[in-house]
Interface confidence: low
């Protein structure tokens, strides 16, 4: 019983349960391949508990190993469109500070219109995650087709 | 030491570790796009710890943020078949209570025969998740090709 | 406060937070379809906290339900290459002890050059996971394109 009470008394944040699920806000300016994200209950089923958004990019607030996941669907897309506009590639990486820039996860669309993947990776407080979509096709803003999230797993 | 003992004395369910992994039982009758799932140790590696099945659909028993994941492989499928029968689409959503009906995750097969994705989403006790497969192609019932699961992540 | 103290006093391992993320080391010799993995901070962002590597295969050290995830990208690949060399298939399974050999997750590449998926599955101490890539195409060793990992979720 003691454990359950103690667990209730402590703020969840002290248990390290940082988690975020974001929806697409908009694409970047010309020559900026980044996707810009938004999150919060007012926007639907997206949320940020711990991590924060900085100019549409996700910033980590707690050191640890995270599960990073993403799905991006291209708008107005068929397998013909996708192959004609190849290569369209999505990369998730640490983009800040720039000196530590590293690609964590990369996928090409080839003849498909959706990519989805996930991976475990260590992240540090202050790391900013960028999602770069290179190519001429635009992503869908439907919240069930394009989303990006992280989940703190362990220290 | 106190913590470990307390943890052992408490039922796991009180820690909020609701989790389920399901295998395909069958497809719905004509005009019903839903996939019907089954789970339990007698069936192999599927299980339900917390959530329950209600007429083949997954019902949530604990409020919280969940990681929802799915993989569906089409049976007797090649890239030619998949493109010829396009659009074949899978959607995972909350189908009950009707007032909360919403699509959480959607993917089209295009020229592929398998889709797989995952996302974080808030779910409430009583939410029932439906997986709708639209199109004329049938899913594989192989347990390593088609599966659906949820994992409670945090309150 | 008591809970936080107790949590700090216990080694993380006793909380059951076994986790691993691996990068591709090499493919097997002819007639051996297995992928051989490596992990550790010296190699970049891969790591093993709990599970171990045994001749390039991942061995589980703690009973429980695990989230298993994988992404494999084929090297020197286009949708034409992928379809020409079809079937190229990836399967993740328990390959030891031999008496429990079972396929957990299977995907074909069809006209794509990357597969990515994840699933929940019960694993037991001593289970060794093998990832079999069948076909003539080779996987990319780029750490952001090909990776394999597990995360302990609950007992």
């Amino acid at each position: 019983q003691r454990f359950a009470q103690a667990q209730q008394q402590l703020p969840l944040e002290s248990l390290g349960w940082d988690v975020a699920e974001l929806q697409l806000n908009h694409t970047g300016p010309q020559q900026d391949p980044r996707l810009y994200w938004q999150g919060g209950p007012a926007l639907g089923r997206s949320f940020l508990h711990g991590p924060e958004l900085d100019k549409g990019q996700l910033r980590i607030h707690r050191d640890g190993i995270y599960m990073v996941h993403i799905q991006v669907t291209l708008a107005i897309c068929s397998s013909t469109t996708a192959s004609r506009h190849h290569p369209t590639t999505l990369a998730v990486g640490i983009c800040s500070p720039a000196s530590r820039s590293i690609s964590l996860l990369r996928l090409s669309f080839h003849q498909g219109c959706t990519i989805a993947s996930q991976r475990l990776t260590p992240l540090a407080r202050g790391d900013t995650l960028c999602t770069n979509l290179t190519g001429t096709l635009l992503p869908s803003r439907n919240t069930d087709e394009t989303f990006f999230g992280v989940q703190w797993v362990r220290p | 030491q106190r913590f470990a003992q307390a943890q052992q004395q408490l039922p796991l369910e009180s820690l909020g570790w609701d989790v389920a992994e399901l295998q395909l039982n069958h497809t719905g009758p004509q005009q019903d796009p839903r996939l019907y799932w089954q789970g339990g140790p007698a069936l192999g590696r599927s299980f339900l710890h917390g959530p329950e099945l209600d007429k083949g659909q997954l019902r949530i028993h604990r409020d919280g943020i969940y990681m929802v994941h799915i993989q569906v492989t089409l049976a007797i499928c090649s890239s030619t078949t998949a493109s010829r029968h396009h659009p074949t689409t899978l959607a995972v959503g909350i189908c009950s209570p009707a007032s909360r009906s919403i699509s959480l995750l959607r993917l089209s097969f295009h020229q592929g025969c398998t889709i797989a994705s995952q996302r974080l989403t808030p779910l409430a006790r009583g939410d029932t998740l439906c997986t709708n497969l639209t199109g004329t192609l049938l899913p594989s019932r192989n347990t390593d090709e088609t599966f659906f699961g949820v994992q409670w992540v945090r309150p | 406060q008591r809970f936080a103290q107790a949590q700090q006093q216990l080694p993380l391992e006793s909380l059951g937070w076994d986790v691993a993320e691996l990068q591709l080391n090499h493919t097997g010799p002819q007639q051996d379809p297995r992928l051989y993995w490596q992990g550790g901070p010296a190699l970049g962002r891969s790591f093993l906290h709990g599970p171990e590597l045994d001749k390039g295969q991942l061995r589980i050290h703690r009973d429980g339900i695990y989230m298993v995830h994988i992404q494999v990208t084929l090297a020197i690949c286009s949708s034409t290459t992928a379809s020409r060399h079809h079937p190229t298939t990836l399967a993740v399974g328990i390959c030891s002890p031999a008496s429990r050999s079972i396929s957990l997750l299977r995907l074909s590449f069809h006209q794509g050059c990357t597969i990515a998926s994840q699933r929940l599955t019960p694993l037991a101490r001593g289970d060794t996971l093998c990832t079999n890539l069948t076909g003539t195409l080779l996987p990319s060793r780029n750490t952001d394109e090909t990776f394999f990992g597990v995360q302990w979720v609950r007992p």
């Epitope: 970047g28 010309q30 020559q31 900026d32 549409g56 720039a98 | - | -």
Partner: antibody, heavy 120, light 107 residues
Framework: EVELVESGGGMVQPGRSLRLSCAAS????????MHWVRQAPGMGLEWVTV????????YYADSVKGRFTISRDNSKNTVFLQMNSLRAEDTAVYYC?????????????WGQGTMVTVSS | DIQLTQSPSFLSASVGDRVIITCRAS??????LAWYQQKPGKAPKLLIY???TLPSGVPSRFSGSGSGTEFTLTVTSLQPEDFATYYC?????????FGQGTRLDIN
């Protein structure tokens, strides 16, 4: 202290060339994109050109395309603007500015400017 | 090219006043807009970026809002040091462009 200092401005005749320099200090120069912006006397601001943090991309305003070249030397923490075939309408104060995010962000640090006068 | 039109071009106000400057883009630029303050003989200074984000060191009386094509810069309680020229800047498409400026004079 983070600082940008321009030099190389002066009076020059139409059709001639001039090379401006911008020396950076107080930050990791190789992490940032750099821009040149100019301001004709009594007028507003006009963006001229940008160079990526690693020199991999360069873009120019139509008014200077083919005449001006931006370059950088990360080992010397310096960005350059080579101005050829100068015209009277190129007369302005030239500012170098740091790109806030390394892609196309805002210009968070500016130099004090160097005056270029093109006149016969 | 994307045209940015600021209004008004000239503005007279007194210390303590609340002033609003608008910037209209000829096409959508998402949130990729910045505001600068420039005093005579000095380089511009960044006030707002990404439409509404304040850099450190900028007083909280400055705020920005808007997205798409309509943006505003608001100064809630003018201080003597705020009398200057203000420029908006779009960074969504090359070439990067600036508004024509708004000169804020003391009344």
């Amino acid at each position: 202290e983070v600082e940008l200092v321009e030099s190389g401005g002066g009076m020059v005749q139409p059709g001639r060339s001039l090379r401006l320099s911008c020396a950076a200090s107080g930050f990791t120069f190789s992490d940032y994109g750099m821009h040149w912006v100019r301001q004709a006397p009594g007028m507003g601001l006009e963006w001229v050109t940008v160079i990526w943090y690693d020199g991999s991309n360069k873009y120019y305003a139509d008014s200077v395309k083919g005449r001006f070249t931006i370059s950088r030397d990360n080992s010397k923490n310096t960005v350059f603007l080579q101005m050829n075939s100068l015209r009277a309408e190129d007369t302005a104060v030239y500012y170098c500015a740091r790109d806030e995010v390394g892609f196309v962000g805002a210009f968070d640090i500016w130099g004090q400017g160097t005056m270029v006068t093109v006149s016969s | 090219d994307i045209q940015l039109t600021q209004s008004p071009s000239f503005l007279s106000a007194s210390v303590g006043d609340r002033v609003i400057i608008t910037c209209r883009a000829s096409q959508g630029i998402n949130s990729h807009l910045a505001w600068y303050q420039q005093k005579p003989g000095k380089a511009p200074k960044l006030l707002i970026y990404y439409a509404s984000t304040l850099p450190s060191g900028v007083p909280s009386r400055f705020s920005g809002s808007g997205s798409g094509t309509e943006f505003t810069l608001t100064v809630t309680s003018l201080q003597p040091e705020d009398f200057a020229t203000y420029y908006c800047q779009q960074l969504n498409h090359y070439p990067i462009t600036f508004g024509q400026g708004t000169r804020l004079d003391i009344n």
